[in-house]
């Protein structure tokens, strides 16, 4: 998606299928305010952007209210009059899900069902990362729903958890971003605690491709 | 400290629209984790939450009521506001916000609450 | 919805005294329970969570505990200041939902 034109990089985000951020990156305009036009439909005329990003006081992208649009989005990135950037794409290709939210642990015996508020749409994995301090890495569980039952847990090991949603593949193709973690959260027999001693901080997942 | 501060119109009509203001301090709703929640209380009756919003603009509504309910935020403001369209008799209550404990993560709660304010719709 | 019931609505006690206040939800709740005090000027403020865990600044006079359906609220030592309506609220499934509350009044 980061296509130059006249050395202008951009990426395009769709989150949540809420907002549309379009940013760009263009050394030879730095200390220029481009000026971005988009449409939703080929036959319309372009509306020109009104919720500017600004770095260091110039314009560097735009974000876009596109609410559960399945639609191309056709745009213009402008030096005055003049194109630099000119595209179309499928807003979907780069969807970023939410963060889940009320994210929550029942305890039976040695397994945990991890559930929490389902997205809106569909088309979604929901993943639940989990270690103690005496594993070297994290194991993964997921699912279609948020609802992942991890079984095989040892009582006594205090075990960290956080969960993302992604999106699949095979419906949005290979350019989405998956959502940020959740918050971590630690239990220990069936209780919740502050923290499982020695447990490395988990590493943040990619935003860029 | 934490500090919530609800604002509103006191007296309504039935079918005009609410707009409550919830101003807070001494947190962000810019952090990974925070919200802000409205709650309201009909004289001498229980508690009933309405709605939600979170730091990332995901919002929650009580079902009961979603097709009523309107939640958003200024963040760079510090402020959320709920709106509720065509008000009855039954929405008159105090109307309380309160931030989502964040003290342990995914324990959803509420450690902080505004002082309320009162709505009364009568014709 | 999850229904939250507090069968007491009102509670008489006597200073000194320590006092039990339940609730019950209509399905496991996982200890997704928080308690909250109402003054009568209307103030509410966050006792516990997390059935019973006890938010920072609040006295150990208060206490919590259950699991399941059934959760209690436990003061001791009651005092004139402890004077307020007492609601439960289940945070495990949307949406929340609070109990009808009890009345904590002094004999």
């Known amino acids: 998606q980061g296509g130059a034109a006249e050395g202008v990089q951009i990426q395009i985000i769709y989150f949540n299928l809420e907002t549309v951020q379009v940013t760009w990156n263009a050394s030879k305009y730095s200390r220029t305010n481009l000026t971005f036009h988009y449409r939703f439909n080929g036959d319309e005329a372009y509306d020109q952007c009104t919720n500017y990003l600004l770095q260091e006081g110039h314009t560097s992208g735009c974000l876009l209210d596109a609410e559960q649009r399945d639609d191309i989005l056709y745009f213009s990135i402008r030096n005055g009059t003049h194109p630099v950037f000119t595209a179309s794409r499928w807003m979907v290709y780069y969807l970023k899900p939410s963060s889940p939210k009320h994210v929550r642990f029942s305890w039976h015996q040695d397994a945990v069902t991890v559930t929490c508020s389902d997205l809106s749409y569909g088309d979604l994995l929901y993943e639940v990362q989990y270690r103690s301090p005496f594993d070297t890495e994290w194991q993964s569980k997921q699912e279609n729903t948020c609802n992942v039952t991890i079984e095989g847990l040892d009582a006594e090991k205090c075990y960290s958890f956080w969960v993302r949603v992604k999106a699949m593949e095979d419906v949005y193709g290979p350019d989405t971003y998956p959502s940020d973690w959740s918050e971590v959260t630690c239990w220990q027999r069936g209780e919740i605690r502050d923290a499982c001693a020695e447990t490395p901080t988990p590493p943040k997942p990619k935003l860029s491709k | 400290q934490v500090t919530l501060k609800e604002s509103g119109p006191g007296i309504l009509k039935p079918s005009q629209t609410l707009s409550l203001t919830c101003s807070f301090s001494g947190f962000s709703l810019n952090t990974s984790g925070m919200g802000v929640g409205w709650i309201r209380q009909p004289s001498g009756k229980g508690l009933e939450w309405l709605a939600h919003i979170w730091w990332d603009d995901d919002k929650y509504y009580n079902p009961s009521l979603k097709s009523q309910l309107t939640i958003s935020k200024d963040t760079s403001r510090n402020q959320v506001f709920l709106k509720i369209t065509s008000v009855d008799t039954a929405d008159s209550a105090t109307y309380y916000c309160?931030?989502?404990?964040?003290?342990?993560?995914?324990?959803?709660?509420?450690?902080?609450w505004g002082q309320g304010t009162t709505l009364t719709v009568s014709s | 919805d999850i229904q939250m019931t507090q069968t007491t609505s009102s509670l008489s006690a006597s200073l000194g005294d320590r006092v039990t206040i339940s609730c019950r939800a209509s399905q496991d709740i996982s200890n997704y329970l928080n308690w909250f005090q109402q003054k009568p000027d209307g103030t509410v403020k966050l006792l516990i969570y997390y059935t019973s865990r006890l938010h920072s600044g609040v006295p150990s006079k208060f206490s919590g505990s259950g699991s399941g359906t059934d959760y209690s609220l436990t003061i001791s030592n009651l005092e004139q200041e402890d004077i307020a309506t007492y609601f439960c609220?289940?945070?495990?499934?949307?949406?929340?939902?609070f109990g009808g509350g009890t009345k904590l009044e002094i004999k």
């Open positions: 309160a931030r989502r404990a964040s003290h342990v993560s995914t324990v959803d709660s509420f450690d902080f």
């Open positions: 609220q289940q945070g495990y499934t949307l949406p929340w939902t």
